[in-house]
């Protein structure tokens, strides 16, 4: 913490300008009025303050706004944003996409994923839902940031907005997030023809249930292995060899290359070796011929 001293008369600050870069930390603390700083935040980013000096300015704002900064200040934080912790950001109420854009630009190239995720969360809360304008801003200024949102926040995306989401925006989404987004995408693209539908739904298929994957296998979609590998393990395991062959089409030979990676490995273990042999790929590890499969989980559920 910066020690308290009184401000020398000749150092009194009446406006935020470049002369402040020559102030020592304790002089900034003593001489800069927090209310003046807040009122002239738009000037701060143009002044080449050191990181130590920025620490003092942040401390000033923290004292003035213990419950969180107002958006008029947040919008003009500039490089001062780099000093914010997720805990600081959690106190904010942000509704303006201009504020979001400004801070996303500042954070680019810095290790600030936790701060950015919290900021986006505050924007979604502030705006009430993840609307098209917010999604467009995220895809333009922060590809992949959509996946920093919790499944609960993503549930506020209207299906009509899903079309604005690009494949690369979903690259870092986990299974729980795709579980939320997939039904919305299915709804958004339901009126499209088979091939067009598959192109659109492909990035969301990590959230698809088995019955939807089975349905795709009847539509000659020729799913690539990259997409197949992103399917939920639970969605892949019940598929038969014939269904997987139909689903992958000419890409089925890729199973050989990926046979040691999940979910391919787990799926192989559930198939009869006889059935796997029909693919002619030399896949090994299936259930030997003549073995009886007892599904004990079904028996437990009945007892």
């Amino acid at each position: 913490d910066v020690e308290r001293t009184t401000c020398p008369p000749e150092k009194e600050v009446h406006e935020i300008d470049e002369s402040l870069i020559f102030y020592k930390k304790r002089e900034l603390e003593a001489c800069v009025d927090a209310a003046l700083l807040a009122a002239q935040m738009d000037r701060v980013d143009a002044i080449p303050f050191t990181y130590e000096q920025l620490d003092v300015l942040k401390h000033k704002l923290d004292e003035l706004y213990p419950q969180g900064y107002p958006e008029s200040v947040i919008r003009h934080l500039g490089h001062l944003f780099l000093k914010m912790s997720p805990e600081d950001i959690r106190k904010w109420n942000v509704t303006s996409l201009e504020t979001l854009k400004a801070l996303l630009k500042v954070s680019k190239g810095h290790e600030m994923s936790a701060q950015v995720a919290t900021l986006i969360d505050r924007v979604v809360v502030g705006r009430g839902q993840l609307d098209k304008d917010t999604v467009d801003t995220l895809t333009a200024f922060c590809p992949g940031c959509l996946c920093s949102l919790s499944p609960e926040r993503l549930s506020s995306v209207p299906p009509s907005v899903i079309g604005a989401v690009r494949p690369q925006d979903l690259d870092t989404c986990g299974p729980r997030q795709l579980d939320v987004l997939y039904p919305k995408a299915r709804l958004a693209f339901q009126n499209m023809s088979g091939s067009e539908y598959f192109v659109k739904i492909r990035p969301f298929l990590g959230g698809a249930p088995t019955e939807d994957v089975k349905a795709l296998s009847q539509q000659n979609v020729s799913m690539d292995l990259a997409t197949f590998m992103k399917l939920r393990r639970e969605a892949v395991l019940p598929l038969t060899v014939a269904e997987v062959q139909k689903l992958l089409g000419p890409h089925v030979e890729g199973l050989k290359v990926e046979e040691q990676h999940s979910p391919v490995r787990d799926w192989i273990l559930k198939q009869r070796q006889d059935d796997l042999d029909t693919l002619g790929l030399g896949l090994q590890g299936g259930i030997p011929n003549g073995y009886l499969i007892l599904d004990l989980s079904v028996r437990e559920a009945l007892s």
Epitope: P167, D224, L225, M229, K230, K256, Q260
Partner: antibody
Framework: EVQLVQSGAEVKKPGASVKVSCKAS????????MDWVRQAPGQGLEWMGD????????IYNQKFNGRVTMTEDKSTSTVYMELSSLRSEDTAVYYC????????????WGQGTTVTVSS | EIVLTQSPATLSLSPGERATLSCSAS???????LSWYQQKPGQSPRLLIY???NLASGIPARFSGSGSGTDYTLTISSLEPEDFAVYYC?????????FGGGTKVEIK
């Protein structure tokens, strides 16, 4: 432009560990596995293993089992290869190479990272 | 593991000549799962041919590949000065993936 950019050269003592990074750009990171291949001075190429960035799943060449660990960071499109208990015969150039999931050929390679193990 | 043996170890030829490089596998390789790479001194390897005979993007048509089972061939119909390098075959038909020991094509 598709690029794989690796971390700089390393000099390590026997018994130490080395962690090499490979940052991908210009393509959908999770549509390709990342494999690691090494080349000892004046020698041929040796496959070490791969990682699926989508699932984080790994396969290692048994020759390196227990010594090699591959990890990924989807947020930065970066893959890491750590080799532990280094010995002099681990002196080599280590390459990351992109492999489209479902194929086995490497269509883009990193520039290589020289690791020297010497006491 | 499948051992890939490349022959000859060194091939001394002049520009304009035809180069034939062999790759022999210790057990059968599915032809879809064999590729060839070129490596020049101080550079990373570069994909030339995949799935035995498919030319990779940007590779000139003077390169071609053929073969099946245990025997595979890379042919350069007419050597250009930039073709003098080391060539490796590679299989992913069986785990672990393996490379051949390489054939060095040098200027005679």
């Amino acid at each position: 432009e598709v690029q794989l950019v690796q971390s700089g050269a390393e000099v390590k003592k026997p018994g130490a560990s080395v962690k090499v990074s490979c940052k991908a750009s210009g393509y959908t990171f999770t549509d390709y596995n990342m494999d690691w291949v090494r080349q000892a001075p004046g020698q041929g190429l040796e496959w070490m293993g791969d990682i699926n960035p989508s699932t984080g799943g790994t396969i290692y060449n048994q020759k390196f089992n227990g010594r090699v660990t591959m990890t990924e960071d989807k947020s930065t499109s970066t893959v890491y290869m750590e080799l532990s208990s280094l010995r002099s015969e681990d002196t080599a150039v280590y390459y990351c190479a992109r492999r489209r999931i479902g194929t086995g050929y490497f269509d883009v390679w990193g520039q290589g990272t020289t690791v020297t193990v010497s006491s | 593991e499948i051992v890939l043996t490349q022959s000859p170890a060194t091939l001394s030829l002049s520009p304009g000549e035809r180069a034939t490089l062999s790759c022999s596998a210790s057990s059968s390789v599915i032809s879809s799962y064999l590729s060839w790479y070129q490596q020049k001194p101080g550079q990373s390897p570069r994909l030339l041919i995949y799935r035995t005979s498919n030319l990779a993007s940007g590779i000139p048509a003077r390169f071609s590949g053929s073969g099946s089972g245990t025997d595979y061939t890379l042919t350069i119909s007419s050597l250009e000065p930039e073709d003098f390098a080391v060539y490796y075959c590679h299989q992913w038909s069986s785990f672990p993936y393996t490379f051949g020991g390489g054939t060095k094509v040098e200027i005679k």
